[in-house]
């Protein structure tokens, strides 16, 4: 007894096509590109029916249903727009990812299409959604010429500035990603095994302001070449935050130096350092203060410290800054803060130095402030961030 002639479902075809189908004859259904086999609610990888001896097929005809990529992933710090139509997620539908303007940026154009494999796919063939990376190095600060001592910072001047509070100590750091803080190893060394006891505040100008964004450390990474109490070589550390902070006008990462940045940190080039450390009056600053200071000649700086503190070495991993006449320097409590420079080409600020050490007499004539030379540690920073997660570091020339 023959089985009834099978009729191909819409958007599908049958093979083989026969004049008559008898016992044990079979046919398969194939869907055209962009459609999938569906039996009720169940997607099938393949479909073959067999003619039974009672003249019926052993299974009902499936349908060829348009591929549905489903709702796209949410985009942290961004959003997705449906281009084809509201909530349309089927084959060849188009969506557009975009990041929150000003503070986040996307490497791709953000356009994704629902493809036949059921994945949202970018024009480059990427199946994963894009990432909104924080913009770095935007500031309202302008280099202010001949200032003696410090000046109070204004909102948006140093949005990367981070206050690190221990039970009895205070230091600084610089946000370099939405969940990484760069600081000096000596400033967090005692906390390395008890990261959670470090209180991290950002988005503030007043040191004691109650309106701060709180961040908690997950782990502290001290440079393996740093030896506590035996000089300040490799005085650099990274703090991974438990959660990503939201980037805005008062909280933003500073950029890391690109390779070409070395030319912007030559002798007499001006950088800026900010902090809540001791001021000329010998008291901790209530308001975030900053000072614009020139890079000092490395040989001069080395000679000064050889004379002042025999056995303390100014290494090639350090840079010195300050005036021969003195008066402009970082001081105790500023440790770990960033010495930043403006990249004229990109108009972004990058971290060139980390407040490390100096003369006991801050700002004394002929006694420079010594900073960790960040450009020497880019591979170390990138390695830590890529191995321990939470997004890549920000080189401002990417933007």
């Amino acid at each position: 007894r023959p089985c009834p002639d099978p009729t191909a479902p819409p958007n599908g075809s049958i093979s083989p096509v026969q004049a008559i189908y008898v016992l044990k004859d079979r046919f398969s259904v194939f869907c055209k590109t962009g459609f999938e086999l569906l039996q009720g609610s169940v997607p099938l990888k393949s479909f073959t029916a067999v003619c039974q001896k009672d003249g019926s097929w052993d299974r009902p005809m499936p349908e060829c249903s348009i591929i549905d990529c489903g709702p796209p992933d949410d985009l942290p710090n961004g959003h997705v727009d449906y281009i084809t139509g509201p909530e349309v997620t089927t084959y060849k539908a188009v969506i557009q990812y975009s990041c929150e303007e000003t503070f986040y940026t996307m490497s791709s154009n953000g356009k994704y299409v629902c493809e036949a494999d059921g994945f949202w796919t970018s024009s480059k063939g990427e199946k994963l959604p894009p990432v909104c990376e924080p913009v770095c190095g935007l500031s309202t600060h302008t280099i202010g010429g001949q200032i003696v001592g410090g000046q109070p910072a204004k909102p948006g001047d140093f949005p990367w500035q981070v206050l690190l509070l221990g039970q009895t100590t205070a230091a600084a750091g610089a946000l370099i990603h939405d969940n990484w803080v760069l600081t000096a190893a000596h400033a967090v060394y005692e906390k390395r095994m008890a990261a959670s006891s470090l209180n991290i505040r950002m988005g503030i100008l007043k040191r004691l302001s109650p309106h701060y964004t709180q961040a908690w450390p997950e782990e502290i990474f001290i440079h393996e070449g740093y030896t506590h109490g035996a000089g300040f070589d490799n005085d650099i550390a990274l703090i991974k935050l438990k959660n990503k902070v939201t980037i805005n006008g008062s909280i933003m990462p500073v950029c890391l130096p690109r390779k070409e940045a070395a030319s912007l940190m030559r002798t007499d080039f001006t950088g800026t350092v900010a902090g809540w450390g001791l001021t000329q009056k010998g008291l901790l600053a209530r308001n975030l203060m900053f000072v614009d200071i020139p890079i000092a000649d490395h040989q001069k700086c080395t000679a000064v410290y050889e004379k002042l503190y025999p056995g303390v070495r100014v290494s090639a991993n350090m840079l010195c800054a300050g005036l021969e006449t003195g008066g402009k320097d970082a001081c105790r409590g500023d440790s770990g803060g960033a010495l930043v420079f403006l990249d004229n080409e990109t108009q972004r600020w990058f971290v060139g130095g980390i407040v490390s050490w100096g003369s006991i007499n801050c700002g004394a004539a002929d006694q420079y402030g010594v900073y960790t030379k960040v450009i020497n540690y880019i591979p170390w920073i990138e390695n830590i961030i890529s191995n321990f997660g939470g997004g890549g570091s920000h080189h401002h020339h990417h933007h």
């Epitope: 569906l38 039996q39 009720g40 609610s41 169940v42 997607p43 099938l44 990888k45 393949s46 549905d68």
Partner: antibody, heavy 118, light 107 residues
Framework: QVQLQESGPGLVKPSETLSLTCTVS??????????WGWIRQPPGKGLEWIGS???????YYNPSLKSRVTISVDTSKNQFSLKLSSVTAADTAVYYC??????????WGQGTMVTVSS | SYELMQPPSMSVSPGQTASITCSGD??????AYWYQQKPGQSPVLVIY???KRPSGIPERFSGSNSGNTATLTISGTQAMDEADYYC?????????FGGGTKLTVLG
């Protein structure tokens, strides 16, 4: 965001009929994209699919339970229901309702514990 | 009736890769689905149609299915991944679940 909520008696006597309702909020049960399913989980054991229904009323059931199961839909109330007859202690379980989108159950209700005991 | 078999339990150290298997006759010919269930909570879909991740599921979850075995892989396993994991498939329009695997994250 669609949410599902199971409701019904927590205690049923042996040989009686277990009746549960799942209320769908944040989306229409009449969407052509979805079936709606029931799954259960006896205490400390694994998951067992009971059956699924389309808004038009077409159903498919687990063959091992088919003779005792009825799933129905009420589109006006945005609900679907489960009836399981002739229950025994072996039917004691957490009963979940879930949206069945192309064979995948997502999301699930929070589940309701039903104990069969005299 | 169709059966899906899973190892009852397995353990993994944080940061390591966990591979949970599910075996069934010619399982690779049909789609496999994976659900995560934490104590006292409803199951959550983590992989569908062998290897697709629903919105909101971390990238560390991935799936594969060929021959008689489907595998759920969790790379860089975290403490929060400790849960029961169930595979599921449809055979002749009947939903079938595996017995579940209890994943313990050590430490």
């Amino acid at each position: 965001q669609v949410q599902l909520q199971e409701s019904g008696p927590g205690l049923v006597k042996p040989s009686e009929t277990l009746s549960l309702t799942c209320t769908v909020s944040g989306g229409s049960i009449s969407s052509s994209s979805y079936y709606w399913g029931w799954i259960r989980q006896p205490p400390g054991k694994g998951l067992e699919w009971i059956g699924s229904i389309y808004y038009s009323g077409s159903t498919y059931y687990n063959p091992s339970l088919k003779s005792r199961v009825t799933i129905s839909v009420d589109t006006s109330k945005n609900q679907f229901s489960l009836k399981l007859s002739s229950v025994t202690a072996a039917d004691t379980a957490v009963y979940y309702c879930a949206r069945d989108r192309r064979g995948r159950f997502d999301p699930w209700g929070q589940g309701t514990m039903v104990t069969v005991s005299s | 009736s169709y059966e899906l078999m899973q190892p009852p339990s397995m353990s993994v150290s944080p940061g390591q890769t966990a591979s949970i298997t599910c075996s069934g006759d010619k399982l690779g010919d049909i789609y496999a689905y994976w659900y995560q269930q934490k104590p006292g909570q409803s199951p959550v879909l983590v992989i569908y149609q062998d290897n697709k991740r629903p919105s909101g599921i971390p990238e560390r979850f991935s799936g594969s299915n060929s021959g008689n075995t489907a595998t759920l892989t969790i790379s860089g396993t975290q403490a929060m991944d400790e849960a029961d994991y169930y595979c599921q498939a449809w055979e002749s329009s009947t939903g079938v679940f595996g017995g579940g695997t209890k994943l313990t994250v050590l430490g």
